[in-house]
Interface confidence: low
């Protein structure tokens, strides 16, 4: 299953199957989940060791049995995969880090007035893999306010290295953030030329396609058909790129089809894996298990489960099959491929679904229409998780927030049903920025039940939570996926960075704004909010976040939306939002629902009717 | 010396009305929301109702609502019970305490008793 | 509504003796639970809060102590002052609810 777990001052020895320069341990983890054999990772930060060529080393690791031994090492930060957990598999890294340079090949240098800047410049450039930044106290004049753009091989630095007023990061290509735009069209019969950068096998052009695009070099691809004229080169998928970006020539040729990597595409990517299952073909590989199992699928899912299974072959071979269970052929690679693709057999072959979005396991396991203020514009995809609740009578405008914690499930507070229980009146938009985008044509999804906690009552402000299930499930986006929720009754989990989002007033008199507002409030003890809140009672199943000076808060329409901190690299929804006395005034924080002291009542809802949790909290 | 002093209970007719007060001393009224308990002869304490500090909110227990409405004034230092329709249900000795959500109700008053007979 | 049921209704016991009283709520209530102490003619006084907190001006020898939905009330050495009947009210959710009380007789 899914392991989110970090531990400290921990390193895994052995089982070593590759190992690079990352910023940080999320984005080592990240790599791990991406490369087909690793399971584990070990991360070492600059603070951790003196050893110049180690500092910043990501260890990509292995083992048969799932784990390996940990060893003490002060600094160290090691982990799982997350393969197997659904959402939170993205490819798209947006920290800034402070201090670092992380080096490669300089391709383009330009002078930008912010970091920020720098990273669009990235994203915007076809061959940009990540970026630094000098700012405007770097030490030597001529260098201020560069933005150099770079790549290397294996898409990560070649070295980092600490160095003051230097800001670096990574593309947001793979966040779906790339003005760019993609070439959705495949080419039959035609073949790119230039460089290669890696040869795989793949049963067909789309799976060719989808490895080239998470694939760090590969801007384009050539595969060739199970007919192609030469026996030894069927199934090739190459993946190519060019100096340019383009391929420079391209030949007609028989049995070949030639695309482009989709890494450009705005607002959407294809998943990182591959679902189709293909009837009379064997996929060839290292054997990991055989199991007897009833049906293709159920030996799809049999792969799937077992983390390290990368492709499987279900044979109906009467040898190989007794009453209606047949052979199930667990199998793996080296590069995540099949080692062999057989075409006529009685089998059928697929791939595993773990870096899939769309599992199960997608998700991690007030007193008035309240409330951003002093919050600033959210981008793209920051926020995927909110969601519009808007109400269509006469006029249709947005009441409150949501969040996206399932493909069939919002979450929200149960005061934005006060007087609006009717189901048919609202309108959910999920993965949308403005709200003035928003047209007739819009695509929104309707409501199948309102379900409120059943001890809410209206005007009092405990128990403030439903859930809305949707009509019709949602697919993951990089601009539209759910948020983890909290491990039930988490106390001991101290949240330093938490952000509250909405589309709320932005001061207490005010009106409902365009762009989604994101700001930064730090959570307030239930002790220090009940000496503020004299009048209601702060209970355990409420968490309260404000500054003291007043100044940032939510605010009129905000209410239902998340209150959501980042812990070890993972947003978690830790409230909703629900009640406070007016908007950022001084010392009256925003009071929210805890969500972690609903979990049994989350789970218990969202039962499906088959009784398998359609959402789990992370391990 | 915290202290709160009920008035206002007697006998009364069913269906009738009756307006309880709680006077306080001794504690900045105005910061504590209030409330009233009351308790039937030989029977054990039922909450009835309760007010925030300011007014703003009041709520009640379901055998009472839509008949009983809790108020307060705190220039007089003064919470209030108007009891409407009154049943003989409602026959009991009403108590009104300061009611501090950190450390419940913390100081009553001696309470004040409420007949409803015919 | 949340529902109190304290245990036992009535108890005799002599001075000097440990006596406990529990309270079960019908659901979590997570530690929002307080015990009270009446006497005949008297208005209620508050002696545990929030579980097990002592209230001001309250002998130690009174104890609480749970969580979830099970509480429970402890005189250490029960002495004449202190045959009463104590009830537990819960305010994790309004409205409150007291329990039926437990009535403390001399044996």
């Known amino acids: 299953g899914c392991l989110t777990q970090l531990y400290e001052n921990a390193f895994f020895r052995g089982g070593d199957v590759a190992s690079m320069y990352t910023p940080n341990a999320q984005y080592c983890q990240m790599r791990c989940t991406f490369h087909p054999r690793c399971l584990l990772f070990s991360f070492l930060p600059a603070s951790s060791i003196n050893d110049m060529e180690k500092r910043f080393g990501c260890f990509l690791k292995d083992s048969v049995t799932g784990t390996l031994p940990k060893v003490h090492r002060t600094g160290a930060v090691s982990g799982h995969s997350l393969k197997q957990c659904g959402h939170q598999i993205s490819a798209c890294h947006r920290d800034i880090y402070k201090g670092v340079d992380m080096r490669g090949v300089n391709f383009n240098v330009s002078k930008v007035s912010s970091v920020e800047e720098c990273q669009k410049r990235c994203t915007s450039n076809i061959r940009c893999q990540f970026f630094s930044y000098a700012t405007q106290t770097f030490h030597k004049a001529e260098y201020r306010n560069n933005c150099l753009l770079k790549y290397s091989p294996g898409g990560t630095p070649t070295a980092i290295k600490v160095l003051s007023n230097v800001e670096s990061g990574f593309s947001l290509k793979p966040c779906a953030l790339s003005e760019i735009g993609c070439h959705m069209n495949i080419f039959q019969h035609l073949a790119f030329s230039d460089v290669d950068v890696a040869r795989v096998l793949t049963p067909d052009a789309f799976v060719c396609r989808t490895i080239c695009t998470y694939h760090p070099n590969c801007l384009f691809f050539t595969f060739y058909t199970n007919v192609w004229k030469i026996e030894s080169q069927r199934n090739v998928c190459l993946l190519k790129t060019s100096e340019s970006g383009t391929p420079s020539s391209s030949t007609p040729q028989e049995n070949t089809i030639s695309g482009y990597s989709l890494l450009t595409c705005k607002r959407t990517l294809p998943e990182p894996c591959h679902s189709k299952i293909y009837p009379g073909v064997d996929f060839g590989g290292e054997e990991l298990n055989v199991t007897f199992v009833k049906g293709v699928n159920v030996c799809q899912e049999t792969c799937t489960k077992m983390i390290r299974c990368q492709f499987f072959t279900y044979s109906l071979l009467p040898e190989d099959c007794k009453e209606e269970k047949c052979k199930c052929f667990l199998r793996l690679s080296m590069d995540g491929s099949p080692t062999r693709i057989a075409y006529g057999t009685q089998g059928s072959s697929g791939y595993s679904l773990r870096l899939c979005n769309t599992g199960d396991n997608s998700v991690c396991t007030t007193k008035t229409s309240t409330r951003i203020v002093g919050g600033t514009n959210s981008s793209w995809g920051e926020w995927p998780w909110q969601v519009s609740l808007q109400v269509k009578l006469t006029a249709q405008r947005h009441l409150c927030g949501g969040s996206l914690i399932g493909h069939q499930w919002v979450l929200t507070a149960a005061h934005c049903f006060d007087g609006l229980p009717l189901q048919d009146v609202w309108r959910i938009y999920s993965g949308i920025l403005n709200l003035s985008d928003i047209t007739k044509d819009t695509p929104f999804s309707q409501i199948k039940e309102i379900i409120i906690h059943q001890n809410y009552k209206v005007s009092e402000g405990n128990h403030d939570i439903a859930l809305i299930k949707l009509q019709a499930p949602l697919n993951y986006t990089e601009f539209q996926k759910p948020i983890c929720l909290p491990s039930k009754g988490d106390t001991s989990t101290i949240y330093t960075n938490c952000w509250v989002t909405g589309w709320g007033f932005s001061k207490e008199k005010g009106e409902i704004q365009n762009i989604l507002q994101k700001v930064n409030i730090p959570l307030v003890t239930n002790e220090e909010c009940q000496k503020r809140y004299q009048d209601y009672k702060i209970t355990q199943r409420m968490v309260c976040a404000g500054y003291k000076e007043g100044g940032k808060d939510a605010c009129k329409g905000d209410s239902g939306g998340p209150l959501v901190c980042k812990h070890n690299g993972m947003w978690r929804l830790v409230g909703i939002t629900s009640w406070g006395e007016g908007c950022a005034r001084r010392e009256q924080p925003g009071v929210y629902t805890k969500v972690a002291e609903y979990m049994d009542w989350i789970l218990e809802k969202t039962q499906s009717s088959d009784g398998k949790a359609q959402m789990q909290s992370p391990a | 010396e915290v202290q709160l002093l009920e008035s206002g209970g007697g006998l009364v007719q069913p269906g009738g009305s009756l307006r309880l007060s709680c006077a306080a001393s001794?504690?900045?009224?105005?910061?504590?929301?209030m409330g009233w308990v009351r308790q039937a002869p030989g029977k054990g304490l039922e909450w009835v109702s309760r007010i925030s500090s300011s007014g703003g909110m009041t709520i009640y227990a379901d055998s009472v609502k839509g008949r009983f409405t809790i108020s307060r004034d705190n220039s007089k230092n003064t919470l209030y019970l108007q009891m409407n329709s009154l049943r003989a249900e409602d026959t009991a000795v009403y108590y009104c305490a300061r009611d501090d959500w950190n450390v419940g109700m913390d100081v009553w008053g001696q309470g004040t008793t409420v007949t409803v007979s015919s | 509504d949340i529902q109190m049921t304290q245990s036992p209704s009535s108890l005799s016991a002599s001075v000097g003796d440990r006596v406990t009283i529990t309270c079960r709520a019908s659901q979590s209530i997570s530690s929002y639970l307080n015990w009270y102490q009446q006497k005949p003619g008297k208005a209620p006084k508050l002696l545990i809060y929030a579980a097990s907190s002592l209230q001001s001006g309250v002998p130690s020898k009174f104890s609480g102590s749970g969580s979830g939905t099970d509480y429970t009330l402890t005189i250490s050495s029960l002495q004449p002052e202190d045959f009463a009947t104590y009830y537990c009210?819960?305010?994790?959710?309004?409205?409150?609810?007291f329990g039926q009380g437990t009535k403390v007789e001399i044996k």
């Open positions: 001794g504690f900045t009224f105005s910061s504590y929301p």
């Open positions: 009210q819960q305010t994790y959710t309004t409205p409150w609810t």
